[in-house]
Amino acid sequence: GQNITARIGEPLVLSCKGAPKKPPQQLEWKLNTGRTEAWKVLSPQGGPWDSVARILPNGSLLLPATGIVDEGTFRCRATNRRGKEVKSNYRVRVYQIPGKPEIVDPASELTASVPNKVGTCVSEGSYPAGTLSWHLDGKLLIPDGKETLVKEETRRHPETGLFTLRSELTVIPTQGGTHPTFSCSFSLGLPRRRPLNTAPIQLRVREPGPPEGIQLLVEPEGGIVAPGGTVTLTCAISAQPPPQVHWIKDGAPLPLAPSPVLLLPEVGHEDEGTYSCVATHPSHGPQESPPVSIRVTETGDEGPAEGSVGESGLGTLA
């Protein structure tokens, strides 16, 4: 048999080998496609199937506008002028080239040594689904699950049957100061069909800068709270990407999951003490905040706030 690829929506003519070019003809076309459950023999006189597959006067079969449901096998059996039976067999596949792929939500820059989302490559309207590939400086990027991560999603339109592909690229650049170029290409995987490429994006890779400073904010302000009240400690860091934050009370690490916020609900005297946060940045090690003091006092029995001047006129520091 012969393999035929036809573009969706385009006409396709299959010739019936051995058939006389003009009537009288002895021929039979039958098909097994997405429109049939078994073999369907087409009437030479024509009929309701003519809108999808019609026998032409020369014995060829015309598919006026091929669709996904027309994929399948087409066979013709003809008797030639010498009385010999000749068979033709076609395996028809259809395809649709999507629109040019695009990189949506591209990064503005990348940071070395940490995971960075480069962008999402989107291709809409393909059949069959095809594949998306990423390229770095013109070379194919092979996802390794560590330095190069690709998250893929394929969706099929319920009415048209065409596919939308999405591919999200995440990379960990090894060093700063470089300017890598990323692009994405779509391939249908059909012979003689060149891949479709996105416009490339060039990104600057910078070294992860040290945190510009670490601040510990306390609510209520001053760190004085009545028993049963709530204290919120927030570790504010300007570093990118956000580092892991651990907490220290009176010099000892608190056995808590890393979080930039520490909540102390329904405080008692056991919660009193000196608190600080430690930010751990992948490339710069730990950095500790200045400490704050938390005091639990009865309402109306509030002592002076940290660093304030008491009635004695002496500066007091908790």
């Epitope: 049939t36 459950e37 309701p48 003519d50 809108s51 999808v52």
Partner: antibody, heavy 119, light 107 residues
């Protein structure tokens, strides 16, 4: 809204002729096959003629072949049925329907026009 | 030519009843069968497309099924507005053939 409106029915003598029209609106007329179906008084439905979307190919049952001609004018969104050599058994309500090929069947129908063949 | 043998030709039923109408094709017609409802003095209205697909705007109490060359229209719970005549149609081969019709009457 898809709308099919038949006209042209009436009383005609046996052997006479009549031309039915069907005005279509609310859809892209030249994308669809069109069909005429008839129903004799108190009887069931009978297929009369179909035409493909371009108008190049027409189809008839033996009962009306060589007497009836289906045609269309895509510029006017109109379907026609020319009926010649009419017989008493052609008396029926004639309906215009959208479709007639395997992609559609008959999805919309007009309200019908009555043709009476009697002397 | 293909024959579409529809049964029963008439039936009496009450509101709320489950009603089943059958058409048998004399040869394979694939899925290419429509079901129509017709009320006196009105044009037919398509209920089911391609054997099993509910047409737009048709209540879900109507359903179509197929087993080989046997096609069935089912009304799960008959409503007062469902008393009418029902027809099947094969549109796989010319001449296109309708079933003889089933008149559903009030018991």
């Amino acid at each position: 809204e898809v709308l099919l409106v038949e006209s042209g029915g009436g009383l005609v003598q046996p052997g006479g002729s009549l031309r039915l029209s069907c005005a279509a609106s609310g859809f892209t007329f030249n994308n669809y096959w069109m069909t005429w179906v008839r129903q004799a008084p108190g009887k069931g439905l009978e297929w009369v003629a179909s035409i493909d979307n371009s108008g190049d190919n027409t189809y008839y049952p033996d009962s009306v072949k060589d007497r009836f001609t289906i045609s269309r004018d895509n510029a006017k969104n109109s379907l026609y049925l020319q009926m010649n050599s009419l017989r008493a058994e052609d008396t029926a309500v004639y309906y215009c329907a959208r479709g007639g090929d395997i992609t559609t069947g008959f999805d919309y129908w007009g309200q019908g026009t009555l043709v009476t063949v009697s002397s | 030519d293909i024959q579409m043998t529809q049964s029963p030709s008439s039936l009496s039923a009450s509101v709320g009843d489950r009603v089943t109408i059958t058409c048998r094709a004399s040869q394979d017609v694939g899925i290419y069968v429509n079901w129509f409802q017709q009320k006196p003095g009105k044009a037919p209205r398509r209920l089911i497309d391609r054997a099993t697909n509910l047409a737009d705007g048709v209540p879900s109490r109507f359903s179509g099924s197929r087993s080989g060359t046997d096609f069935t229209l089912t009304i799960s719970s008959l409503q007062p507005e469902d008393f009418a005549t029902y027809y099947c149609l094969e549109f796989d081969e010319h001449p296109l053939t309708f079933g003889g019709g089933t008149k559903v009457e009030i018991k």
